[in-house]
Each structure stands twice: as structure tokens, then as C-alpha cells.
């Protein structure tokens, strides 16, 4: 017997489609070998119609595909636009020739069934409603009107004009006339289910003079739309259920063998497996909504269904839409840490991947909030000012071309713990989710700035020092001036890194920044940080206030470290030519601040293209340029 298995018999009707799954034994060879679908001829020859090597016959062109699912040990042959010519004997198999392991499949495609010539066909989707039109002659106007459903032997009453209703149609069937027209009656049946499909007869009057009409009601289950997504990417289920359910609660559920488990609904229910990576967004008043899931996992593959019902749960007889989601494990999206850990007072540097082909796209970082339907307000973006409550502690560094941008958040508190999304206005598949965990600090931070209460005096020299441990000795140290458009790295002249050193004196590792002379524009947040190439590490922040000199007092720098820095400054001064670009207010770019749906981020961001570049060291010179110097001792 063949180790390949599938359906022995497949039957369908013209115009429909089939999806044939063939199962193969779980071996590495089987997973990687050629898969094929061939048609058996009278001679016993089997002619290939489609194979996993990319071959597609002329008669299947544009209407068939073959997909291998090595993780399930299956492959699927999808064939659309069936005709009676497709009826025949086929094989699905594995191997370099069509004489390999195979399984026989018989496919029968019938004509759409013949109905009595006067039959009116109504085709409706599950959950929708149908209005059946029943004409009659004027002389039958006073007579009883009825609709019955044909069974093998008889015709079972659905509803009649004496208000008799079959129990399974109570609350769903209505018989009525429109206006003054006495030649037609109507029967409306709502919340259609599969069981409602079949032949009906509507009748006015009795006996030989009765008016009768045959009706064929077809109730269709929605064909699942196939979605192929990469591991770690994102998927959007666009659900369009129609105006009649616009005011009902909406849901997305995932089919299991018993039922459909709700993943999210508009009543606030959310599956914990999707915490931090799902949003449901009502689109409009026409019953349209979408569900976005980021950070796709292997186990997210499966059958999904969206629907609407006041309970927020799947109910028979209500409209639905279905998808089958496949998650490809050979993903183009790099495998990054999905959990980042920080400590109170410390910092985190989060590397966000984006499609390297879209290096000019606008980059954003938003915080996922689970209340209501879930939303993700943007906190920072390449052309989006940092949200006020993150002043001085959040910046985005774009590294054009290498497929990564970095978001740094410092001065962490336990309130910062939660889920954050990296996204761009480009390829929406590259939305990724990060969970930030913040623990209470148990030791001193790695980077410490002195003096801690920094007040500089206008016109004088002011130095701040950043102490770092020996483990950062080989890394690049930097200072940057924070603005709500980014943290502009100040040019440095790094003496210490060029000196060969066998030992490392823990107490003397520092990088200093000197402002000389201090100007009013120097006031603000400064960061001291470490990085290795384009990989950013820890940071710490300090706010430098600028005061005018009070008469009769001379300002003294509070630490010896600053005195040492001044000596260095006499040896070599580097003119930074740093300036802040004009600080124009940029509207928030996103879906998010206004709780608009995430899809809008691209459109919104396009409008905001006017403003400055975050995380860049370029800028126009100030007329009185500050002197900045970085130096190791």
C-alpha cells in the first residue's frame, strides 16, 4: 500500500474550485523532494499538470497551484474554474518521476443540477437574508398564501398568511405584501444557515387553480481566503460583513476541531496568547473592520473566522468571513529578541528591523495599549516629535541602509513595562512586537554622570563627566544633545580608545563633555551612551540648566574631574558646529495618538515629510557655535 494518502474521491460542480491535500510520511527526503499532480491516461501514462519544481501545464495556467507544507508533511493542489473536462483519474505523488510514491484521486465535476424550468434560484451567503418573490393571479388574492420546503416525500410548511410558522423559522420568517400590489407576496427569511438550503414552493390558493412557484435556495459557506505570511511578520484580516450588522459587536475567532475560539472582539475580550500583538479596528458604519496581528508565530497558522453578533461570539445564522493562514518558517524577517529586559533608572536600546529595500521609509515606535479594542499611540518617529511625557528619555536613531533602526528609552520606571511595536510607513509585514520588562534595580547603574544637579552659568565653561565601567572600555562612547526630534550625536575626539592599556582603572574611566562658552541654547537634556559600530548600548541622561551669573559670585565647577577636562580642552578643542534645527511642531504621524487604525500610519506620515532628521549629527551652524570635547582619562 502507498504511504501517500489523500481523498480517494473528490466531487464538485462546474465553476467551483477544489483544494486537495495529500499527506506524506515524515522524512527529510520527502519534505524536500519534488511533489506532483498528474492525470492518468488510458495508456496508464500519468501526465504532469503541476509540480513543486514550478512546472504548470497549459490547461492549468492561471487556475491552479501546488503548495508544499513541509512542517505538516502535506502538499495542497488548488484548482479553480472547474469544468466537466477536469473529470478524471489523477495521482498526487512524490519523486523525480511520476512513477514515484503516489496516491490515486478520482475527480468528478458535474453540471450545475438541472432544476424545473420555472425554478427561481436564490444564492445567498450564510447569515444573510433572502426575500423570495411569489407571484399569483388576482383571483387568488383572497386565498391563503404559503411557502413550504420540499423534503423527500412532502412539502413542509415554513410560513403562511394565517401566521402559522414552522418552529425552526420562528423569528426568522416573515410573509408580507408590498403596498397595493395584489399580485405578489414576499417571504423574507433571515439568519440563513446551511439547513435552509433546498427547494421551496410558494403557493397562493388551493387545488388546480392555485398559483405555484418553485424556488431553489442555495446557502453558501464563504470559501476561505488563503493568506501566506512569514514568521515574525504581521497579518491583517479585513472583514466586510455588511451594513445589516454594523451595530453588532464584531469578533475574530480561530477554528479548532470543536468550535471557534474568540481571539478578540469589540466587547474587550482578548486571547492572552495575542496580548501585545493584536488590534481590532472598526473601519466605518458599514460593518467593516480589521484585525491586525503582529509577531506571527508558527502556532498562529490555522483557520480564522470573523463575524458579528451582539454577544461578540460566533453564532449560527450570522454572517461570517473565513481565512486560512499559513505561516512560512523560512522568513525574511530577522529573528530578534521579542523580550527586552531593563532595570529602573537604566536604559534599553531596541533594534527594530525594517525592509532593507525601504531604507527611506519613515520609522515609528508605538506603545500597544490593550484597553478597549487595543490601540498603539506613536511615541517617536523619524519625523514625529517625541511625546511630551517621554521628554529627555526617548529617541529614535535611523541607520539608513542596514535594515535596522534603534529606539533608546532611558530613565526607566516600572510604568514603562509593556508591549511596543516597531513599524514603518512602508512594508506593513515588517511590524514587530517587543515586550519590555522592567525590574527594580539592585545595583548602581553602569553609566553615571557627575555633577548630577547640573546648572551651567551663561558665558562660562561647563563640564560634565560620564563614568563608565571597564567592560565598556573598547566600546565607542558618545554624548548627544536630546531634542524632540532625536538625539544629535556630538562629534568626539576619543583619546582614550587609542591608548593601549593592559589594566583598566575602574575609578578613572570617563568621557567628558565641555560647553565653552555656555549659551542659553545649551540648556536641555544630554545623553551619555556607548555603542559598538551601529549597535547602540546603554545610555544615561542629564538635564543641564543654564543660569545667568549672579553679581559678585564666581562659578566654580564642583568636581576634580571637570578640572581635568579643562586641561584636556587646552590641548585640543574640537568645534562641533552643532545646532538644533528650527523646532517646527510636527503633527503626530499616527494611527495611534488619535487612536486611528494602524494602517493609516503610512498616509499620515507622508503628510509630515517636511521636518528634520532625528538621530543625525548634521545641522546648520549656530552663529556662536558651542565648543564640545569628549576625552578619556
Amino acid at each position: 500500500k502507498s504511504p501517500i494518502f489523500g481523498p480517494q474521491e473528490v466531487s464538485s460542480i462546474e465553476g467551483d474550485s477544489v483544494s486537495i491535500t495529500c499527506y506524506y510520511p515524515d522524512t527529510s527526503v520527502n519534505r524536500h523532494t519534488r511533489k506532483y499532480w498528474c492525470r492518468q491516461g488510458a495508456s496508464g501514462m500519468c501526465t504532469t499538470l503541476i509540480s513543486s519544481n514550478g512546472y504548470l501545464s497549459k490547461e492549468y495556467s492561471g487556475r491552479a497551484n501546488l503548495i508544499n507544507f513541509p512542517e505538516n508533511n502535506t502538499f495542497v493542489i488548488n484548482i479553480e474554474q472547474l469544468t466537466q473536462d477536469d473529470t478524471g483519474s489523477y495521482k498526487c505523488g512524490l519523486g523525480t518521476s511520476n512513477r514515484g510514491l503516489s496516491f490515486d484521486v478520482s475527480l468528478e465535476v458535474s453540471q450545475v443540477p438541472e432544476l424545473p424550468s420555472d425554478t427561481h434560484v436564490y444564492t445567498k451567503d450564510i447569515g444573510r437574508n433572502v426575500t423570495i418573490e411569489c407571484p399569483f393571479k388576482r383571483e387568488n388574492a383572497p386565498s391563503k398564501k404559503s411557502l413550504c420546503k420540499k423534503t423527500n416525500q412532502s412539502c413542509e410548511l415554513v410560513i403562511d398568511s394565517t401566521e402559522k410558522v414552522n418552529p425552526s423559522y420562528i423569528g426568522r420568517a416573515k410573509l408580507f405584501m408590498k403596498g397595493t400590489d395584489l399580485t405578489v407576496f414576499y417571504v423574507n427569511i433571515s439568519h440563513l444557515t446551511h439547513n435552509d438550503a433546498g427547494l421551496y414552493i410558494c403557493q397562493a390558493g388551493e387545488g388546480p387553480s392555485a398559483d405555484k412557484k418553485n424556488v431553489d435556495l442555495q446557502v453558501l459557506a464563504p470559501e476561505p481566503e488563503l493568506l501566506y505570511k512569514d514568521l515574525r511578520s504581521s497579518v491583517t484580516f479585513e472583514c466586510d460583513l455588511g451594513r445589516e450588522v454594523a451595530n453588532e459587536a464584531k469578533y475574530l475567532c480561530r477554528m479548532n476541531k470543536e468550535t471557534c475560539d474568540v481571539i478578540i472582539n469589540t466587547l474587550g475580550k482578548r486571547d492572552p496568547d495575542f496580548e501585545g500583538r493584536i488590534l481590532i479596528t472598526p473601519k466605518d458604519d458599514n460593518g467593516r473592520f480589521s484585525v491586525l496581528i503582529t509577531g506571527l508565530r508558527k502556532e498562529d497558522a490555522g483557520h480564522y473566522q470573523c463575524g458579528a453578533h451582539s454577544s461578540g461570539l460566533p453564532q449560527e445564522g450570522w454572517p461570517i468571513q473565513t481565512w486560512q493562514l499559513f505561516v512560512n518558517e523560512e522568513s525574511t524577517i530577522p529573528n530578534r529578541r521579542s523580550v527586552v529586559k531593563g532595570v529602573t533608572g537604566g536604559s534599553v536600546a531596541i533594534a527594530c528591523p525594517y525592509n532593507p529595500k525601504e531604507s527611506s521609509s519613515l520609522k515609528y515606535w508605538c506603545r500597544w495599549e490593550g484597553d478597549g479594542n487595543g490601540h498603539c499611540p506613536v511615541l517617536v518617529g523619524t519625523q514625529a516629535q517625541v511625546q511630551e511625557e517621554y521628554e529627555g528619555r526617548l529617541a529614535l536613531f535611523d541607520q539608513p541602509g542596514n535594515g535596522t533602526y534603534t529606539v533608546i528609552l532611558n530613565q526607566l520606571t516600572t510604568e514603562d513595562a509593556g508591549f511596543y511595536w516597531c513599524l514603518t510607513n512602508g512594508d506593513s509585514r515588517w511590524r514587530t512586537t517587543i515586550e519590555l520588562q522592567v525590574a527594580e534595580a539592585t545595583r548602581e547603574p553602569n553609566l553615571e554622570v557627575t555633577p548630577q544637579n547640573a546648572t551651567a552659568v551663561l558665558g562660562e565653561t561647563f563640564t560634565v563627566s560620564c563614568h563608565y565601567p571597564c567592560k565598556f572600555y573598547s566600546q565607542e562612547k558618545y554624548w548627544c544633545k536630546w531634542s524632540n526630534k532625536g538625539c544629535h550625536i556630538l562629534p568626539s575626539h576619543d583619546e582614550g580608545a587609542r591608548q593601549s592599556s593592559v589594566s583598566c582603572d575602574q575609578s578613572s574611566q570617563l568621557v567628558s563633555m565641555t560647553l565653552n562658552p555656555v549659551s542659553k541654547e545649551d540648556e536641555g537634556w544630554y545623553w551619555c551612551g556607548v555603542k559598538q559600530g551601529q549597535t547602540y548600548g546603554e545610555t544615561t541622561a542629564i538635564y543641564i540648566a543654564v543660569e545667568e551669573r549672579t553679581r559678585g559670585s564666581s562659578h566654580v565647577n564642583p568636581t576634580d574631574a571637570n578640572a581635568r577636562a579643562k586641561v584636556a580642552l587646552e590641548e585640543e578643542v574640537v568645534d562641533s558646529s552643532i545646532s538644533e534645527k528650527e523646532n517646527k511642531a510636527i503633527p503626530n504621524p499616527g494611527p495611534f495618538a488619535n487612536e486611528r487604525e494602524i494602517q493609516n500610519v503610512g498616509d499620515q506620515a507622508q503628510e509630515n515629510r517636511a521636518s528634520g532628521d532625528a538621530g543625525s549629527a548634521d545641522g546648520q551652524s549656530r552663529s556662536s557655535s558651542s565648543k564640545h570635547h569628549h576625552h578619556h582619562h
Epitope: P7, S12, I13, D16, P222, K257
Partner: nanobody, 126 residues
Framework: QVQLVESGGGLVQAGDSLRLSCAAS????????MGWFRQAPGKEREFVAT??????????YYADFVKGRFTISRDNAKNTVYLQMDSLKPEDTAVYYC?????????????????WGQGTQVTVSS
Amino acid sequence: QVQLVESGGGLVQAGDSLRLSCAASGRTFPTYAMGWFRQAPGKEREFVATIRWSGSTQYKYYADFVKGRFTISRDNAKNTVYLQMDSLKPEDTAVYYCAATTLLGDPRALNEYAYWGQGTQVTVSS
């Protein structure tokens, strides 16, 4: 919930035929699969046949030992699945169980099925 009730079992001679019925009641789903498994005394439950449907398309799966002797079919209007068993052999003696699921992976796997009937006894004497 879905309730499944089997009927049609009994005692027959080798070579005879039987038709088993499985009626589903309660909640039914748009895409469904219903099948038959059997369990002979002292043996494990094994796959016999399954029918899966999606719209107007039907897929029928059979175990190797069936070899054209058994036919699975369904009556949509009655929510009933049938197993027509011809050319019965003594080794077909078993309790036959009806099973149903809303979602079908491998039709042969017991754990793919969510709902089970109580079973109907089929005895084939030689």
C-alpha cells in the same frame, strides 16, 4: 454542542450489506467533516472513512482495507452521514463510531475529531 446518533448496525452473514446512519443535531458549522471509525474487541479504534465538504465540493477518504467495498455519503438537508457497507467480511466485526469535527487536519487521526457518537455494533458471521 453537536450530538451524534448512530443507527443501522446488526448481525449479518459474510458477503451481505449494511447501511449505517449517523444523524447530527445541535450546532452545525459551515465547513464540516464527519467520518466513521471502528473498534474490534481487544484492538485500537481505527479509521474507516470520512467525508468532508466545503460549499458544493465533497472529499471522501477511505482506509486501505475498504478497497471499494464501503461508500460514505451524506444528506445535507438531514444532517446525516451514511456508510454503505457491501461484501462484508467477518473481520469487519466491530463497534462502528461516528465522529465529527469543524476543522480537519489528517482525516485518519482520532484526535482530529471533536464529537463522537456512542457506537453501533456490527457483527458479521461466517
